[in-house]
C-alpha cells in the first residue's frame, strides 16, 4: 500500500529556518502535493504550499521555497520570523494526490530529541564549536606569538650579541593543523550529504585568516527545481486548460531526474573552495 513519509529538520546554521521533506512510496504518478501545518489537509490545517509536477508551485507565508526533490518527493523551506519558534511544536502534513486513483496524507513534526539520524535535526552545536575553535586557535597563535616576541626581546636585551636572529618556526601553521581537520570532521558528522575534502596546507601569517573558513551554509543558492521547467505559474489562454491537462498525464512518467545544488564548504589554503554535494539522490 502507498505510504507518505514526512521529515522535519531544523537548519544547523539558522535556528529559525526549518525544512519539511515529504515523499511518496508507492506506484503511480503524483498529480498534486499539498503541504499544510497545524493539522491535516482540510481538518484545521493551514496550507503552506501546493506543488504540481508540471505546472509549478504555489506557496504561502511563512513558506520560503517549495521544490521537487525527485518525482515523488518534495521539500519546503520555512522561515520563522518570530522570536520564539512556533515551528518546533507544529505538525506539518503532506498530502500526495494521484487523480483519480486516490490521495495519501501523513504528518510529522520536529523530533524532540537531537539523536543523529534521518529524522533528527542537525544540531548546531558542533559548528559553533568549530567556529569557536578557529577563533580560539587564532587567538592562541597571536598570544603565543606576542609572548614569544616579548621573550625574544628580553633575551636580546640581556645578550651581548644583538646580531643573533632567532630561527622562525611557523607556530601558526602547526596550530592550524591541529584544528582544521577537526572542523572538517565535525561538519561532516552533521551534513551527511556533503563531500568534504579535509586536505590543507600549512598556513603562514599572511594567508591564515578567520574569514577563510566558511561555516556550513544553510542553503546553496539555487533556483526552484522540479519536474516543471519553471516554478512560476504559466500564463495560459482562457479556456485552454484542457490542452494542458491532456498532455499532463501522458508525460507524467517521463520526467528526468534533477541534480542537486552544490554546496560551498571547506577551503584550502587559497581560500574557500567549492565542494561537490547533493541534497540526496534525485
Amino acid at each position: 500500500t502507498p505510504e507518505v513519509w514526512v521529515q522535519v529538520q531544523m537548519e544547523a546554521t539558522e535556528l529559525s529556518s526549518f525544512t519539511v521533506h515529504c515523499g511518496f512510496l508507492g506506484p503511480g504518478s503524483i498529480s498534486l502535493v499539498t503541504v499544510s501545518w497545524g493539522g491535516p489537509d482540510g481538518a484545521g490545517g493551514t496550507k503552506l504550499a501546493v506543488l504540481h509536477p508540471e505546472l509549478g508551485t504555489r506557496q504561502w507565508a511563512p513558506a520560503r521555497q517549495a521544490r521537487w526533490e525527485t518525482q515523488s518527493s518534495i521539500s519546503l523551506a520555512l522561515e520563522d520570523s518570530g522570536a520564539s519558534s512556533p515551528f518546533a511544536n507544529t505538525t506539518f502534513c503532506c498530502k500526495f494526490a494521484s487523480f483519480p486513483e486516490g490521495s495519501w496524507e501523513s504528518c510529522g513534526s520536529l523530533p524532540p530529541s537531537s539523536d543523529p539520524g534521518l529524522s533528527a535535526p542537525p544540531t548546531p552545536v558542533p559548528i559553533l564549536r568549530a567556529d569557536l575553535a578557529g577563533i580560539l586557535g587564532l587567538s592562541g597563535v597571536l598570544l603565543f606569538g606576542c609572548g614569544y616576541l616579548l621573550h625574544l626581546l628580553r633575551r636580546q636585551k640581556h645578550r651581548p650579541t644583538p646580531r643573533l636572529q632567532p630561527s622562525h618556526t611557523n607556530s601558526q601553521a602547526l596550530t592550524a593543523q591541529a584544528w582544521a581537520p577537526s572542523q572538517a570532521s565535525q561538519a561532516a558528522l552533521h551534513d551527511p550529504y556533503a563531500t568534504i575534502n579535509t586536505s590543507f596546507c600549512p598556513a603562514t601569517l599572511d594567508t591564515a585568516h578567520p574569514n577563510g573558513w566558511a561555516s556550513l551554509p544553510t542553503h546553496a543558492a539555487h533556483q526552484p527545481q522540479g519536474p516543471a521547467a519553471s516554478a512560476s505559474t504559466p500564463i495560459l489562454a482562457r479556456g485552454s486548460f484542457v490542452s494542458v491537462e491532456n498532455g499532463l498525464y501522458t508525460q507524467a512518467g517521463e520526467r528526468p531526474p534533477h541534480t542537486g545544488p552544490g554546496l560551498t564548504l571547506f577551503p584550502d589554503c587559497r581560500g574557500p573552495r567549492a565542494v561537490e554535494g547533493r541534497f540526496g539522490v534525485r
Epitope: D41, L55, P100, V244
Partner: nanobody, 120 residues
Framework: QVQLVESGGGSVQAGGSLRLSCAAS????????MGWFRQAPGKEREGVAH???????RYVESVKGRFTISQDHAKNTLYLQMNSLKPEDSATYYC??????????????WGQGTQVTVSS
C-alpha cells in the same frame, strides 16, 4: 479532507440532458476552484469545467454552449447541467476541488465519480 459525492449520472439518448450534482461535506476556502473532470475508457482524463473562487466559470472547448457549471454555496453543492449530449460525452464524471495553476484547476480532492452514458 473534503468529502465529495456525485449524483445525477445515468444513460440518455444523444441530444438529451442530464444534471450532475456534487455535494461537498463542507465548503473549503482553502482551495481555489471546484469543477468537473471526466474520463472515458481508453481516453485521457480531461477537465470539463470549473469555477474559480471568484465565481468565473471556465469550460473546455468541446462543451462550450452545451454545458453549464454552477454552485449553490448555501447547500455546498456544485452542478453541471449537460444539454445536447453526444456519444463522445460518455465517461465517468468526477467532481473535484483543487488549486489553480493558470487556467487549470489541479484536483486536490474528488469524489468517486458518476457514470454518464450517451447512446446514439
Amino acid at each position: 479532507q473534503v468529502q465529495l459525492v456525485e449524483s445525477g449520472g445515468g444513460s440518455v439518448q444523444a441530444g438529451g440532458s442530464l444534471r450532475l450534482s456534487c455535494a461537498a461535506s463542507r465548503y473549503t476556502s482553502r482551495t481555489d476552484c471546484m469543477g468537473w473532470f471526466r474520463q472515458a475508457p481508453g481516453k485521457e482524463r480531461e477537465g470539463v469545467a470549473h469555477i474559480d473562487s471568484d465565481g468565473i466559470p471556465r469550460y473546455v472547448e468541446s462543451v462550450k454552449g452545451r454545458f453549464t457549471i454552477s454552485q449553490d454555496h448555501a447547500k455546498n453543492t456544485l452542478y453541471l447541467q449537460m444539454n445536447s449530449l453526444k456519444p463522445e460525452d460518455s465517461a465517468t464524471y468526477y467532481c473535484v476541488v483543487g488549486f489553480k495553476f493558470g487556467d487549470y484547476c489541479a484536483p486536490n480532492d474528488w469524489g468517486q465519480g458518476t457514470q454518464v452514458t450517451v447512446s446514439s
